[in-house]
Structure formats: C-alpha cells, structure tokens
C-alpha cells in the first residue's frame, strides 16, 4: 500500500505570533514530515525449505517488498554476504544469473522474488543449521539483506515461515541516495521542531486521520526490522560450509557483469568464456548510475558445471511491491 501522510491542516497563525520567518519555518517541517512518512521502508523476506523428495536438498526463496527497482540480488550461505558468507548465486535483472555449486537452479519467481535450489549431495552440500542470506540492491533504498535457516526440528517437506531478517540493514548506497536526503530532512525536521518547542504553537485543526494513526506508521520498519537494524553483523560458521570456498582470489575489475551475454538462453549452459572472469572481492556497492553493481562477495572464480547463466527475467523498472503498489 502506498502510504500517504495525513498532514493536519494548519490554521492561519494569529497576528503577532509569527515573524517574517513564520511561514517558512512552519511549512518546511510539514513538507519534510510528509517526505519522512511517505518514504516506505523496504523489507526482505527469506524462506528456507528442505525438500521431502531429496532429504539434503534445499529451496531458498527470497522476496523484496519495497517500491524501488531491483538492481541486483545476491544469495549467500554461512552468514550475510560480506560478513563471512559465501556467495551461492547472483541474479542481475538485465545481465543474467550466475550460480555456483551446490546451487542447482536460481530463477526469478516474480519480478520481486527469487528462488534457489541447492544440490543435496557432495562435500559442499548444506545441512539443517546452515544460514542462508539474500541481499537485494535496489534504487533508491540501497541494499537490504535478510537471513534465515531451517528450524532444527523441521520435518522434511516443511519450511520455516518466511520472515523478515534477523539480520537486516540498509547499506551505504541507500544512505547516500534519496534515503540520505530523507534522513537529513527528518533530522532537520526534528531540529526545527525542537527549536519551536519554546515558541507559541499554531492551532492545529484535527484531521480525519491523526499522524499517530497506524496508517501513518507504515513508513517505519517493522518491529523485527527495527530491532534488526541494530544487530551487528555476525560471522556465522557452520560445519556445512566447504572450507575451499573461502580461499582468496585476485581482485577483478568492477565491470565483471559486462562479460555476461544478454541473449536468450533458457537452458543452463556449460562453462562459458566468461566463467573464468575473476570476481571482485566483496566490499562495495557502487552507484547504479555508473553502471557498476554490488560485488558478489568473496568467491574464487569457478569454471565447473555449477556455473549457469539465464538472461534477464525482467527489465529495469520502477517496482510495484506491496509498499508501493500502484
């Protein structure tokens, strides 16, 4: 639902109460308040499911609930991407999908959700206590990541209820983008309101929906999200993570996606020429305007059969997720 601020109507100030600055200082806070309230907070959800048919096969499903356009999705295990996690798949809305063993099939379920099937056998197979994380890079919200794992007592075929992240954060990209402007605006608004505290306040005509109504609260993160924003990243080590995947690798240039073909190829392909392209080390989200995208995390370059490319499942677009439905 697109949330609209219900701003109380201002009565004309009484003569003598306001100076020349009056109108400006009164109007600006309400404009900023409107911006703050209408800036919907995105949410990422993760569901981990063990398949009943193959007891060590997992399906990870993640979705983005926000109003921005997705520029990259990264799925990792063993903890958040960039905090000890190992990348399983990277899905780019235009340039395709890259995945690494034991990931078997990554795909877009909708234009705002993805799924990933993990192979159940071999040294690199996951186990029940593995943590899986999904990171959605979007504009203008920045990067939002959620993690989930299978409950210890889960029966095969059952799944953990998909919930927003125990670990969830907005990366620098969002703060530097529009979110940054809004954040500054909100801080400035508080500053203005504080300054106004000792001045006579204008009479407010109550509106049908007060700013405290649940409707106006929709811009704030969910309680889980709010708590999660304060949770520092923890490196989660599990006995299921193959040690070989943690080896360092040469730093590649930021344009590693450029080598991905964009032609239609629905079937999984074998190792391609671009498969040996070094993947850059984790660390930065570079502005979408530069045509550079989130780094894929610390992974050695793979050239084995686990590497698959599917071209773009959706075009670049302004999303219509639940927090911004048209």
């Amino acid at each position: 639902m697109r949330t609209e601020a219900q701003v109380p109507a201002l009565q004309p100030p009484e003569p003598g109460l306001e100076g020349a600055m009056g109108h400006r200082t009164l109007v600006l806070p309400w404009v900023l308040l409107t911006l703050c309230v209408t800036a919907g907070t995105p949410e990422v959800w993760v569901q981990v499911r063990m398949e009943a048919t193959e007891l060590s096969s997992f399906t990870i499903r993640c979705g983005f609930l926000g109003s921005g356009s997705i520029s990259l999705v990264t799925v990792s295990w063993g903890g958040p991407n960039g905090a000890g996690g190992t990348t399983l798949a990277v899905l780019h809305p235009e340039r395709g999908i890259r995945q690494w063993a034991p990931a078997r099939q990554a795909r877009w379920e909708t234009q705002s959700s993805i799924s990933l099937i993990l192979e159940g056998s071999g040294a690199s197979s996951p186990c029940a206590n593995t943590t899986f994380c999904c990171k959605f890079a979007s504009f203008p919200e920045g990067s939002w990541e959620a993690c989930g794992s299978l409950p210890p007592s889960s029966d095969p075929g059952l799944s953990a209820p998909p919930t927003p992240a125990p670990i969830l954060r907005a990366d620098l990209a969002g703060i530097l983008g529009v979110s940054g402007v809004l954040l500054f605006g909100c801080v400035y608004l508080l500053h203005l309101l504080r300054r106004h505290k000792h001045r006579p306040a204008p009479r407010l005509q109550p509106s049908r929906t007060s700013p405290q109504a649940p409707r106006a609260r929709a811009w704030a993160p969910s309680q889980a999200s709010q708590a999660a924003l304060h949770v520092p990243y923890a490196t989660i080590n599990t006995s299921c993570r193959p040690a070989t995947l943690d080896t360092a690798h040469p730093h590649g240039g930021p344009s590693w996606w450029a080598s991905l073909p964009t032609h239609a190829a629905h079937r999984p392909q074998g190792p391609a020429a671009w498969a040996s392209t070094p993947i850059p080390a984790r660390g930065s989200f570079v502005s979408v305007e530069n045509g550079l995208y989130a780094q894929a995390g610390e992974r050695p370059p793979h050239t084995g059969p686990g590497l698959t490319l599917f071209p773009d499942p959706r075009g670049p677009r302004a999303m219509e997720g639940p927090l911004g439905v048209r």
Epitope: E43, Q47, T110, Q111, P161, D312, P313, G315, P316, P322
Partner: antibody, heavy 118, light 111 residues
Framework: QVQLQQSGAELAKPGASVKMSCKAS????????MHWVKQRPGQGLEWIGY????????EYNQKFKDKATLTADKSSSTAYMQLRSLTSEDSAVYYC???????????WGQGTLVTVSA | DIVLTQSPASLAVSLGQRATISCRAS??????????MHWYQQKPGQPPKLLIK???NLESGVPARFSGSGSGTDFTLNIHPVEEEDTATYYC?????????FGGGTKLEIK
C-alpha cells in the same frame, strides 16, 4: 491507457500449429513481463508462462513446456505465443496479461479463441 | 505445484447481503507481512478483472464493498453489500512460486 490487443480466433486441425499475437500499448512494453493464461470453455484459468520482452527470457508451467513457445518483438511491442501439435484439449480461449512485480495481472487482452477440429 | 481450493463452487446471495468466498492453498503463500494471493472477477465473455492484490490490497477503481483477508494458507474474499452487477465467477491466484495457479472458481449468483 494500457491496452492489450489480441489477434482473432483460430480454427486449426489436430496436429497443426497456431501462432497468436498480443499487441501492447499505453505503457513501456519492456518494463513488465507478459504472461499467458488458458481457459477452456466453462472451465477455470491455467497459467501457461511468461516472457520478459526486454530480453526474451521465459519461464513455463511444466505442463505447457512442450506445447507453447513464447516470443516477443520489442520493435512492435508485440508478444506471441505459438501452440504446436494441437489436440482437442487445446481448444480454449488464450489470454495475454501484463504482469507486475508481484505477478498479479491488472491488464488482460480480450482473449483469442482457438478451436481444434478435424 | 501449489493447489488452490475454492469454496463454495457456487453461491447464491440476496441483494444487499454479504458474499464470502474462501480460498485454501496447499502450502503457505505468505511472508510475515504480505501474502502472494490475488483475487479476480470474471463475467461471461470477458477477461478476468483484478479486484484484490496481496490478499487485501484493493485494486484502484474497484468498489470498496470488495475486501480481502487472510494469510498463510487461508484466504477470504468478501463482498458486502452484494449488488446485481456482482454476478460473476471469482478466482483466487497465487504468485508464490512458478507455476502460478488459480483456484477452481466460485460462481456468484444474486437472488
């Protein structure tokens, strides 16, 4: 306003193929997926698959994987669906529908009736 | 595949009364915040029309007498008060995973 204009009714013989079209207007054709849905006379709705017109990427309902082929022409903002090896079971109305991020369908074509008869 | 079971298959409601249509999914199609379930109305000879998205979000232009609720596996479409023009078949649809599926439909008749 958004419009999806589908091609006219088709009468085909068993074993033949048909190709129907869905011309989009009123929005950026490459910005959303185009989905196809089947409805047999007096029956419910079945999702066939989608195509991303921007790249040609497709996903199919397994049931229709060997029956339908989805394509798109960006230059004419037209999506196509070809049905092959037709049988009487394929006699139905076929709709194209514009998807959105959550894959609900707010815009539908008027439907193309396919009749398979010897 | 996720199976959507709609009930009842048909329903006759008096003008001005409440019509309640149920849709049950064979597995959860919800996150903690949103449900990937949508409702459509279809009249004879016409394509379906979107009424509700994400279980409870009314599509623009759809009368407020239509409302949706539910999460997880159980969803409900309510129409109150029912009007003559609401005579149609109603379908639920999930978009939780591929393949998307529709319910079998509920035919609403106004008495």
């Amino acid at each position: 306003q958004v419009q999806l204009q589908q091609s006219g009714a088709e009468l085909a013989k068993p074993g033949a193929s048909v190709k129907m079209s869905c011309k989009a207007s009123g929005y950026t054709f490459t910005s959303d997926w185009m989905h196809w849905v089947k409805q047999r006379p007096g029956q419910g709705l079945e999702w066939i698959g989608y195509i991303n017109p921007s790249t040609g990427y497709t996903e199919y309902n397994q049931k229709f994987k060997d029956k339908a082929t989805l394509t798109a022409d960006k230059s004419s903002s037209t999506a196509y669906m070809q049905l092959r090896s037709l049988t009487s079971e394929d006699s139905a109305v076929y709709y194209c529908a514009r998807g959105s991020s959550g894959s609900w369908f707010a815009y539908w074509g008027q439907g193309t009736l396919v009749t398979v008869s010897a | 595949d996720i199976v959507l079971t709609q009930s009842p298959a048909s329903l006759a409601v008096s003008l001005g009364q409440r019509a309640t249509i149920s849709c049950r999914a064979s597995q959860s199609v919800s996150t903690s915040s949103y449900s990937y379930m949508h409702w459509y109305q279809q009249k004879p000879g016409q394509p379906p029309k979107l009424l509700i998205k994400y279980a409870s979000n009314l599509e623009s232009g759809v009368p407020a007498r239509f409302s949706g609720s539910g999460s997880g596996t159980d969803f409900t479409l309510n129409i109150h008060p029912v009007e003559e023009e609401d005579t149609a078949t109603y379908y639920c649809q999930h978009s939780w995973e591929i393949p998307y599926t529709f319910g079998g439909g509920t035919k609403l008749e106004i008495k």
